[in-house]
Interface confidence: low
């Protein structure tokens, strides 16, 4: 999918009121530093493709990503702000929602999620380097 | 060390112009979001305007008691800041602090502020 | 507009625990973020993102947020904390929004 058309705006302030949240919640008792960011973007619709990616291909020891509470955010997100992209996620991410377990979080997946992390913030706003 | 350094205030009459700088020191100042804040005598703290980094399109929002008649600008060769203040109002006085934003939109690095002063 | 509310006035006994309210609609949808201002002096972030303490900023700092308040908690009040104190929010239509501070006073 080709995100260039859509309303990043509204999908950064989707991300600022609630996604954020939920991101740092699932990483919650993970120290900031224990992570390096491997994963970059370029620009918005790049980065939203790497989002994409990362939230919802399974890979390699973490398979479950997409049953989160932000993956389904970030779907219905996408849903609504990007011309285009399937309008059947919404009713896929409401039913994963009813039938969601609790999957046990894997140092991959924290792995995953901190990269996902560094992806929203570059999105948002420049690679900060702090001092 | 992050430092922030403000210049250019002083005593300006009503409608008159006045243009403050904020030199940056210690930090990549181009990969950073900058801010004016202001605080009027006995007062709290009010937000004037910032401007973006050059890789979010380095575009300006303003307070609406501001707008159209501040400018906010930046030069990242030489790591400096700018506020170009016209018209300015009786109500413009106040210590204006520049100050660099960090994720989630706080600011965590200010300057020790300028005093401008607009008075006939 | 969006509009934070503070308390004019907080006070508190040394070495006892303080906390400095800040409210708003669906605040606890929104990063809030403190500061403290002493007189004369730039304001200093304590607290960013509801509850994370910048480096040199004492653990006696802490924050929540839920709801529609914000709390700063100051543990172990110290002189050195008489300040003025203010907590912030990023808004979609007012941008960034300052409440209109707290005076904390520690009584000895």
């Known amino acids: 999918y080709d995100f260039t058309n859509c309303d990043f705006e509204k999908i950064k302030a989707a991300y600022l009121s609630t996604i954020s949240k939920d991101l740092i919640t699932y990483m919650s008792g993970t120290k900031s530093t224990e992570f390096n960011n491997t994963v970059s973007c370029s620009n918005r619709p790049h980065c939203l493709t790497e989002i994409q990616s990362l939230t919802f291909n399974p890979t390699a020891g973490c398979a479950s990503l997409a049953k989160e509470m932000f993956a389904m955010k970030t779907k219905a997100a996408l849903a609504i702000w990007c011309p285009g992209y399937s309008e059947t996620q919404i009713n896929a991410t409401q039913a994963m929602k009813k039938r969601r377990k609790r999957k046990v979080t894997t140092n991959k997946c924290l792995e995953q999620v901190s990269q996902l992390q560094g992806l929203w913030r570059r999105f948002n706003r420049p690679l900060l380097k702090q001092q | 060390e992050v430092q922030l350094v403000e210049s250019g205030g002083g005593l300006v009459k009503p409608g008159g112009s006045l243009r403050l700088s904020c030199a940056a020191s210690?930090?990549?100042?181009?990969?950073?979001?900058m801010h004016w804040v202001r605080q009027a005598p006995g007062k709290g703290l009010e937000w004037v305007g910032h401007?973006?980094?050059?890789?979010?399109?380095?575009?300006?929002d303003y307070a609406a008691p501001v707008k159209g008649r501040f400018t906010i600008s930046r030069d990242d060769s030489k790591n400096t800041l700018y506020l170009q203040m016209n018209s300015l109002k009786t109500e413009d006085t106040a210590v204006y602090y520049c100050?660099?934003?960090?994720?989630?939109?706080?600011?965590?690095?200010w300057g020790q502020g300028t005093l401008v002063t607009v008075s006939s | 507009s969006y509009e934070l509310t503070q308390p004019l006035s907080v006070s508190v006994a040394l070495g006892q625990t303080a906390r400095i309210t800040c409210s708003g609609d669906?605040?606890?949808?929104?990063?809030v973020h403190w500061y403290q201002q002493k007189p004369g002096q730039a304001p200093v972030l304590v607290i960013y993102?509801?509850?994370e303490r910048p480096s040199g900023i004492p653990e006696r700092f802490s924050g929540s947020n839920s709801g529609n308040t914000a709390t700063l908690t100051i543990s172990r009040a110290q002189a050195g904390d008489e300040a003025d104190y203010y907590c912030?929010?990023?808004?979609?239509?007012?941008?960034?929004?300052f409440g209109g501070g707290t005076k904390l006073t520690v009584l000895f």
């Open positions: 401007i973006k980094s050059k890789t979010d399109a380095g575009t300006t």
């Open positions: 100050a660099r934003e960090i994720y989630y939109y706080a600011f965590d690095s």
């Open positions: 993102g509801d509850n």
């Open positions: 912030q929010a990023a808004d979609w239509v007012d941008f960034y929004v």
């Open positions: 669906n605040i606890g949808s929104k990063y």
């Open positions: 210690g930090f990549t100042f181009s990969d950073y979001w």
